[in-house]
Interface confidence: low
Amino acid sequence: AITEAREEAKPYPLFPGPFPGSLQTDHTPLLSLPHASGYQPALMFSPTQPGRPHTGNVAIPQVTSVESKPLPPLAFKHTVGHIILSEHKGVKFNCSISVPNIYQDTTISWWKDGKELLGAHHAITQFYPDDEVTAIIASFSITSVQRSDNGSYICKMKINNEEIVSDPIYIEVQGLPHFTKQPESMNVTRNTAFNLTCQAVGPPEPVNIFWVQNSSRVNEQPEKSPSVLTVPGLTEMAVFSCEAHNDKGLTVSKGVQINIKAIPSPPTEVSIRNSTAHSILISWVPGFDGYSPFRNCSIQVKEADPLSNGSVMIFNTSALPHLYQIKQLQALANYSIGVSCMNEIGWSAVSPWILASTTEGAPSVAPLNVTVFLNESSDNVDIRWMKPPTKQQDGELVGYRISHVWQSAGISKELLEEVGQNGSRARISVQVHNATCTVRIAAVTRGGVGPFSDPVKIFIPAHGWVDYAPSSTPAPGNADPVLII
């Protein structure tokens, strides 16, 4: 009678009660031995790394039957030692052993390369009992072998705390070559040598390599794997692959593109992110990098005014981020801006030029030639000045701000006056007699208030005393003050 059982996660007793399909009705063992506590039969297949093979061994039981007849040593029967088969084929192998019926709870486990195969569905144990011994055949099957199934398989049985190990069964799965290293895409300098590597393995060995460039074989004679192809240089893009051949056939690697480094394409989408009176923040999208990383970029700026001398300002910056603040520009001016970037090969063409304008700013200089004098008859102080140079107004003048501070013993009072843009003189009332009046003037645009002029002081006497001499600030570069009376 035959009993076939898929292994479960508990020890399978040799005789679990009356034996199904058996003619015998009583299978009480002569001697009951406890099985190794917690020992689990493990019959799941799971690929592992190759390890060292196990040689078979035997257990010599010390137990004797009631008749005291010594038992023979237990050992697995010899079986096929080496199986060679093609990938995706099915394989079944087994190990068998005859065990005296005095032993109970015997389990067989499968091991591959030193690791137990847990939870498999490929392992079946069959029992063939007779009067004195039970023949046990443990079969292991793989429906579609893969390379990872290569290795050394053994059976183990535990009896009376002894371990019996079968001779190894070596499984060798042969198939098409398998790439362990394929060529990789590269960016190379024109006419410069470079290497490509290709490596493939069997079994079966040897594996021979042919190189292919743009669909044509490079080498007439194959090279044994691994192979390094030295390409003396290219002038244009090429696609390389390698063919790996063994007795089972041929495998072709992925095709890799070898690009020739070139100057980059010009940047695109140059745009204005922010404008102030003296700076413009720009961003751009880099063009194609020519298969070589961008190193830096150049921002070219020229005045868009047709009357300008056409000179170009150049600002260099790193390639990242794609953003640059152009500084030291004139207020309320129009500029043409272009961007060019470089890689190790050279500079790109300039991007399409864009037009940008700076905003209005506060004036950068104070009014010039400020003159102050007392008009005692009307009890006023007259103030006169010259407007700042147009270039330094940084916008359209909307007026002037006058600060006048009156100081006498223990009193200090500051007043502010605003005057329109057309004036270059102002009259303020005397606030305090027998005091010093300090005057400063600043130009004003929509962009803000500019710097105040240097202070000009005048003494305001008590009533009845006249000072005809005005106070003033000199114009830059003039030795003598220009007095406007």
């Epitope: 593109q257 690009n259 745009s271 992110r273 922010n274 923040l281 961003s283 999208v285 880099p286 194609f288 990098d289 298969y291 990383p293 961008f294 990242l320 981020p321 794609h322 953003l323």
Partner: antibody
Framework: QVQLVQSGAEVKKPGASVKVSCKAS????????INWVRQAPGQGLEWIGW????????KYNEKFKGRATLAVDTSTSTAYMELRSLRSDDTAVYFC?????????????WGQGTTVTVSS | EIVLTQSPDFQSVTPKEKVTITCSAS???????FHWYQQKPDQSPKLLIY???NLASGVPSRFSGSGSGTDYTLTINSLEAEDAATYYC?????????FGQGTKLEIK
């Protein structure tokens, strides 16, 4: 540490609009772009657009142009994404992310996401 | 629009295994513009690798990236249980910015 905290989940009817907020902290808000990315249930990531908080400069995925509006409030370091004319296929988790000036690069910080459900 | 195609869509692997995810672009991209993200269930994506091969802050050294032209690879050496996630590639070469469809990694 850098944090992007988004507003809570929203349920909307088809045709309606939704406005999701993203409050940034732990860095200078105006120095980095805020990008918006969405992820439909069980799907991949889809970029909507970016805004540069310093000047409000925006760039949109053509697919969302006209329906999505990105905005910022620099006084509160908050970015907003409004999506109009909602359809059922706009049901997704919407993420705000931080990107350097150099807006064509990677997103180094992400908000926790805001689930928007569009259902009649 | 640059289309990124990841392979495989799904992979079930055991701990300690080496995992390779590839991302193929519809046109050539400089390695500066190529990045990888990790997204665990019910979490926001997290920057994993930027500019092809640079590990983002706090990312374990078992992660690495390589590639050029149109083909880019994310490799995880000796997978750990915490690496179960969906991985996305992303290009920053041109607008619209695009992502791969994702590769879901399951730990057996």
């Amino acid at each position: 540490q850098v944090q992007l905290v988004q507003s809570g989940a929203e349920v909307k009817k088809p045709g309606a609009s939704v406005k999701v907020s993203c409050k940034a902290s732990g860095y200078t808000f105006t120095t980095y772009d805020i990008n918006w990315v969405r992820q439909a249930p069980g799907q991949g990531l889809e970029w909507i657009g970016w805004i540069y908080p310093r000047d409000g400069y925006t760039k949109y995925n053509e697919k969302f142009k006209g329906r999505a509006t990105l905005a910022v409030d620099t006084s509160t370091s908050t970015a907003y994404m409004e999506l109009r004319s909602l359809r059922s296929d706009d049901t997704a988790v919407y993420f705000c992310t931080r990107g350097y000036y150099d807006n064509l690069y990677y997103f180094d910080y992400w908000g926790q996401g805001t689930t928007v459900t569009v259902s009649s | 629009e640059i289309v990124l195609t990841q392979s495989p869509d799904f992979q079930s692997v055991t701990p300690k295994e080496k995992v390779t995810i590839t991302c193929s672009a519809s046109s050539i991209i400089s390695s500066n513009y190529f990045h990888w993200y990790q997204q665990k269930p019910d979490q926001s994506p997290k920057l994993l690798i930027y500019r092809t091969s640079n590990l983002a802050s706090g990312v374990p050294s078992r992660f690495s990236g390589s590639g050029s032209g149109t083909d880019y690879t994310l490799t995880i050496n000796s997978l750990e249980a915490e690496d179960a996630a969906t991985y996305y590639c992303q290009q920053g070469r041109s607008v619209p910015l695009t992502f791969g469809q994702g590769t879901k990694l399951e730990i057996k």
